[in-house]
Interface confidence: medium
């Protein structure tokens, strides 16, 4: 007999998200279902089993769903076991950009661009921009093991000049989850300097 | 299929340079931070550097400080390291590693076949 | 930069069960996640373990993981000739802002 999972593989969830991992044979009428985590920690679902299919659900995802999930179907004496890595984020507002003070020629400027509620922040990373001109950009790799929500900012401090009134600051973060376009992992905020 | 291969290594006397290259392929190379790792003769891994995603950001370990420059050109997926001042404790084999998440300071699970750097005169 | 420590060697029978430790600090196993490799000569390392505990796709559970406080430990069950080889473990010091690999344990298997 066989074992799928739906998803295959991975499960890429927002935090607060719904999740549902589903198992099912193929070539077995009456399968037995089991679920676990890899490093056998609570489950924290619910199992619903209707005949060859076994769905976990987990609703509302949080940080102790972070785990590999295996499913094992046992036929008669036979064993399958399939895993499914749930993987969580969060990244649900775009940056802020906040000046030190008015902008004046000459005069020093400090410019602090905010990203909130990130998760997980060592995939984080921001950049600062002055028209098409990079003036910094940062990645927050420490700590990484902290099952928490955090605001991360970057600061620049630079002097303006003449012809920068007008021009447009952007601070541009991007969360490093996903090669797919699945999930929105670049957000942007625009501040015109005037 | 993931794969990603190291160029440019040799024998080179103490106070020159060399530029070791890797050239990826098989992912979405922009989107992952890389590092260069290498192994001395005798001796354990040594983390020398990485490169963010877009290159913006960059770290060295203390005894590279200065004379090694890692950089990335994501429209080629190739990853670089400048090396100058070469000294005879830089001899090794060079990896490129790739970590396993698309981005942050998470494991390496992908690895370039290595490439020998020997510092001698 | 070795900032994380393990005992030179380690050895077992057969179907033994071996584990290595690795120890730091704060800076780094504290509050960042630990990875562990096996590395045979004249081959590139290899991902046994990841974020503490978690294996990658391919690596039989005969390996473990766990971290508690400023230590790390890898597990190694049902030891195989072919597990003879150099383990280290690996994380990022938040001081140093560097990658930071273990001094290496060498597993002979008897």
């Known amino acids: 007999f066989k074992i799928e999972t739906t998803p295959e593989s991975r499960y890429l969830a927002q935090i607060g998200d719904s999740v549902s991992l589903t198992c099912s044979t193929t070539g077995c009428e009456s399968p037995f279902f089991s679920w676990r985590t890899q490093i056998d920690s609570p489950l924290n679902g619910k199992v619903t089993n209707e005949g060859t299919t076994s769905t976990l659900t987990m609703n509302p995802v949080s940080f102790g769903n972070e785990h590999s999930y295996l499913c094992t179907a046992t036929c008669e004496s036979r064993k399958l076991e399939k895993g499914i890595q749930v993987e969580i984020y969060s990244f649900p507002k775009d940056p802020e950009i906040h000046l030190s003070g008015p902008l004046e020629a000459g005069k020093p400027i400090t410019v602090k661009c905010s990203v909130a509620d990130v998760y997980p922040f060592d995939r984080l990373e921001i950049d600062l921009l002055k028209g098409d001109h990079l003036m910094k950009s940062q990645e927050f790799l420490e700590d990484a093991d902290r099952k928490s929500l955090e605001t991360k900012s970057l600061e620049v401090t630079f002097t303006p000049v003449i012809e920068d009134i007008g021009k447009v600051l952007v601070c541009r973060a991007k969360l490093h989850i996903d090669e797919m376009d699945s999930v929105p992992t670049v957000r942007q905020a625009v501040k015109e300097l005037q | 299929q993931m794969q990603l291969v190291e160029s440019g290594g040799g024998l080179v006397q103490p106070g020159g340079s060399l530029r070791l290259s890797c050239a990826a392929s098989g992912f979405t190379f922009s989107s992952y931070g890389v590092s260069w790792v290498r192994q001395a003769p005798g001796k354990g891994l040594e983390w020398v550097s990485r490169i963010s995603g877009s290159g913006g950001s960059t770290y060295y370990a203390d005894s590279v400080k200065g004379r090694f420059t890692i950089s990335r050109d994501n429209s080629k997926s190739t990853l670089y390291l400048q090396m100058n001042s070469l000294r005879a404790e830089d001899t090794a084999v060079y990896y490129c590693a790739r970590p396993i998440f698309y981005g942050g300071n998470s494991a390496f699970d992908s690895w370039g076949q290595g490439t020998l750097v020997t510092v001698s005169s | 930069q070795l900032v994380l420590t393990q005992p030179p060697s380690v050895s077992a029978a057969p179907g033994q069960k071996v584990t290595i430790s690795c120890s730091g600090s704060?800076?780094?196993?504290?509050?960042?996640?630990v990875s562990w490799y096996q590395h045979l000569p004249g081959t590139a390392p290899k991902l046994l373990i990841y974020?503490?505990?978690k294996r990658p796709s391919g690596i039989p559970d005969r390996f473990s993981g766990s971290k508690s406080g400023t230590s790390a430990t890898l597990g190694i069950a049902g030891l195989q000739t072919g597990d003879d080889a150099d383990y280290y473990c690996g994380t990022w010091d938040s001081s140093l802002s560097a990658y930071v690999f273990g001094t290496g344990a060498k597993v002979t298997v008897l």
């Open positions: 974020d503490n505990n």
């Open positions: 704060s800076s780094n196993i504290g509050n960042n996640f």
